[in-house]
């Protein structure tokens, strides 16, 4: 009489999370009479998955009707598979008894669960960084299996190379997580730029998942300042203009100082956006030259996005000669640049000599 064999034909089975897994098992003989049980794992700590004889196993059903006469097929179907179901499953034949006695085990079938990675979440720096600096973006995705996964970074469609990626845990697990950091050099043209984290996995059928971050949330583009004087008006008033250009974000405060004293403070609001996402703002100050004996030092002081103030000064030279009503008055205007300790780039300092 041939010895009973417990046959598990598949060494491994791979199933997508949410699907059902069929684990096949047949026995080679009706003899001896006794039940089949399914276990996950081997040894004393093994977990009972299905017992044909008794117990309640809501997710497990027998593939063949166990009441079928001469049944030798003890395959099972496990529904709604999750990564936690991964492991090696053993079909074990018992001999009828009180209690039933374990007789023989199948070779085991390893169930691996293909679980999709979660949507990648990209996060940027906690505080803005100035253009021409490098910042780090992180991308995280969780819950995938198997472990093999590909992650790429792009900035405006161009793949980034300064990237460090880790998949955890390093050993065997029911599911895995990936975390990647990309270092991105910010430029003044990056207000409208975007970084994309792209994750490719066997479960995604060639349609990678993407997470994005807008550099507008990470970048600060400092303003250029230029102070200029318009022609003196007939009423001895000089119109001095402070042009603040190419800055981002919009949060900006401008203060005019006359000989060091605050003349006016303004806050930028509702400015039109340049094509590149930056903003421009122009402020002017009318200076009554006849009210001054000495030269007037005008300073345009700009505080942008909470950074140290940047100053641009301009001297209005008041002529020593008496002015005639309605005639041009000569005034020498000298522009100088004064700055606080900041990393802002500015136009070259300029000295303007205007003769009217």
């Amino acid at each position: 009489e041939e010895e009973l064999q417990v046959i598990q034909p598949e060494k491994s089975v791979s199933v997508a999370a949410g699907d059902s897994a069929t684990l096949n098992c047949t026995v080679s003989s009706l003899i001896p009479v006794g039940p089949i049980q399914w276990f996950r794992g081997a040894g004393p700590g093994r977990e009972l998955i299905y017992n044909l004889k008794e117990g309640h196993f809501p997710r497990v059903t027998a593939v063949s009707d166990p009441t079928k006469r001469n049944n030798m097929d003890f395959s099972i179907r496990i529904s709604n598979i999750t990564p936690a179901d991964a492991g090696t499953y053993y079909c074990v034949k018992f001999r009828k008894g009180s209690p039933d006695v374990e007789l023989k085990s199948g070779a085991g079938t390893e169930l691996s669960v293909r679980a999709k990675p979660s949507a990648p979440v990209v996060s940027g720096p906690a505080v803005r960084a100035t253009a021409e600096h490098t910042v780090s973006f992180t991308c995280e995705s969780h819950g995938f299996s198997p472990r093999d996964i590909t992650l790429k970074w792009f900035k405006n469609g161009n793949e980034l190379s300064d990237v460090q990626t880790n998949v955890d845990p390093a050993g065997k697990s029911v599911s895995y997580s990936i975390r990647s950091t990309a270092r991105v050099l910010l430029t003044r043209r990056d207000v409208h730029s975007q970084v994309i984290c792209e994750v490719a996995h066997v479960t995604l059928q060639g349609d990678p998942l993407r997470g994005t971050a807008n550099l507008s949330e990470a970048i600060r583009v400092p303003p250029f300042l230029e102070v200029t004087q318009q022609s003196m008006r007939a009423d001895n008033q000089v119109n001095v203009t402070c042009q603040v250009t190419k800055f981002y974000p919009q949060r900006l405060q401008l203060t005019w100082l006359e000989n060091g004293n605050v003349s006016r403070t303004e806050m930028a609001s509702a400015l039109p956006e340049n094509k590149d996402g930056t903003y421009n703002w122009t402020s002017w100050l009318l200076v009554n030259v006849s009210a001054h004996r000495d030269d007037v030092k005008l300073t345009c002081q700009v505080e942008h996005d909470g950074q140290p103030a940047v100053n641009k000064s301009f001297s209005v030279k008041v002529s020593a000669h008496p002015k005639e009503q309605g005639s041009n008055t000569a005034a020498e205007n000298t522009g100088t640049n004064e700055r606080g300790s900041s990393d802002y780039k500015d136009d070259d300092d300029k000295h303007h000599h205007h003769h009217h």
């Epitope: 009706l30 044909l52 009441t67 006469r69 001469n70 009828k96």
Partner: antibody, heavy 119, light 110 residues
Framework: QVQLVQSGAEVKKPGASVKVSCKAS????????INWVRQAPGQGLEWIAM????????HYNQIFKDRATLTTDTSTSTAYMELRSLRSDDTAVYYC????????????WGRGTLVTVSS | DIVLTQSPDSLAVSLGERATINCRAS??????????IFWYQQKPGQPPKLLIY???NLDSGVPDRFSGSGSGTDFTLTISSLQAEDVAVYYC????????FGQGTKLEIK
């Protein structure tokens, strides 16, 4: 431990019906056939019928096909055998038995229910 | 229907001696290497107890002095050394078709 507990003895008049119950425990009721067998006093074993509790599929001995009805209540793991139009020669011990090997055999038996048919 | 005929109807054997009971089917009950014959023991006032399944396989807890053999239409239950507790009625049953029982063999001590 598999157990089949049957209902108590019955005395019936000819022409009446009897319904014997068999409550199963110690195993998954829907995974195994239940057989009904009777034994008249001093006589041999006579197979009546069998039922699959999972889907109520039944097989009857032709002798009993018109008079016996097998049912189950899976919520209580109980099998029933009703025998109608009783005659005096239906006096017997009625056994339920479970087929553990799906071989149409009887591995575990209840203790039996004596049904006496007498006018 | 298959008819099972047991012989003898009754049998008296001395303690420690061999007892043999035969069962003949009206047609073959064998296929694919399996013989669909079962043997039961019934003691007075008790339900039957399965002894042997598929002609030659001892059920759980059955002493090994019991054995079964045969194929096709002829089958035998043997008790190699009769014990006092073996006094009972023995039945064969086939499951080639729907179950039927033999008429029984009463075993007594000589």
């Amino acid at each position: 431990q598999v157990q089949l507990v049957q209902s108590g003895a019955e005395v019936k008049k000819p022409g009446a019906s009897v319904k014997v119950s068999c409550k199963a425990s110690g195993y998954t009721f829907t995974n195994y056939w239940i057989n009904w067998v009777r034994q008249a006093p001093g006589q041999g074993l006579e197979w009546i019928a069998m039922i699959d509790p999972s889907d109520s599929e039944t097989h009857y001995n032709q002798i009993f096909k018109d008079r016996a009805t097998l049912t189950t209540d899976t919520s209580t793991s109980t099998a029933y055998m009703e025998l109608r139009s009783l005659r005096s020669d239906d006096t017997a011990v009625y056994y339920c038995a479970m087929d553990y090997g799906s071989l149409y055999a009887m591995d575990y038996w209840g203790r039996g229910t004596l049904v006496t048919v007498s006018s | 229907d298959i008819v099972l005929t047991q012989s003898p109807d009754s049998l008296a054997v001395s303690l420690g001696e061999r007892a043999t009971i035969n069962c003949r089917a009206s047609k073959s009950v064998s296929s694919s290497g399996y013989n669909y014959i079962f043997w039961y023991q019934q003691k007075p006032g008790q339900p039957p107890k399965l002894l042997i399944y598929l002609a030659s396989n001892l059920d759980s807890g059955v002493p090994d002095r019991f054995s079964g053999s045969g194929s096709g239409t002829d089958f035998t239950l043997t008790i190699s050394s009769l014990q006092a507790e073996d006094v009972a009625v023995y039945y064969c049953q086939e499951s080639w078709e729907l179950p039927t029982f033999g008429q029984g063999t009463k075993l007594e001590i000589k």
